[in-house]
């Protein structure tokens, strides 16, 4: 059996390249796991405008990942 299953990734597209910083309520990072073989960056938008996936290869995502990792470690 494959160790990773793509089927339960949260994002079903490649993700947007950027989100306006002023629109961001919260950013969450989901690291590769048994459910999903890739890193996912989830942006929660202000004013109940839902959530968006940020392309983890984008410049903005890399900055967010760096920021979160600095805070956590």
């Amino acid at each position: 059996f494959p160790m990773f299953k793509r089927g339960r990734c949260l994002c079903i597209g490649p993700g947007v390249k950027a989100v306006k910083v002023a629109d961001i309520e919260k950013a969450s990072i989901m690291y590769p796991s048994n459910n999903c073989d890739k890193i996912e960056v989830i942006i929660t938008l202000k004013e109940n405008k839902g959530q968006r996936c940020l392309n983890p290869k984008s410049k903005q995502a890399r900055l967010i990942i760096k920021k979160v990792e600095r805070k956590n470690f």
């Epitope: 089927g7 990734c9 947007v16």
Partner: nanobody, 126 residues
């Protein structure tokens, strides 16, 4: 910027079928999640189906499961919605929409989509 154009709507009797098309210009649909939505007079726009850009997985609203089928032809830059066993309550303007940053749990939410077509009318009546 992607422009979307829907076609294939029309007047059909209950139990009939249609194939709706969503064609893109100004960009490729390969990277986009494509959703189909509908809006009946005086009602909210609701998501009926969408198809993932990454693995082709499909999602359907409970009201259309088993009757509607979404598919994509990236070579033709087109997404189709085959609608079968139509009921009068399926009468609406049908829109296709494209989005990149779509989460599974928000797959049928209009908030997830950035680009919209003008819509095609589907009327189910005897």
């Amino acid at each position: 910027e992607v422009q979307l154009v829907e076609s294939g709507g029309g007047l059909v009797q209950p139990g009939g079928s249609l194939r709706l098309s969503c064609a893109a210009s100004g960009g490729t649909l390969d990277d986009y999640v494509i959703g189909w939505f509908r809006q009946a007079p005086g009602k909210e726009r609701e998501g009926v189906s969408c198809i993932s850009s990454t693995d082709g997985s499909t999602y359907y609203a409970d009201s259309v499961k088993g009757r509607f089928t979404i598919s994509r032809d990236n070579a033709k830059n087109t997404v189709y919605l085959q609608v079968n066993s139509l009921k009068p309550e399926d009468t609406a303007v049908y829109y296709c929409a494209a989005g990149m940053g779509v989460l599974r749990q928000w797959a049928l939410s209009k908030l997830s989509y950035d680009y919209w077509g003008q819509g095609t009318q589907v009327t189910v009546s005897s």
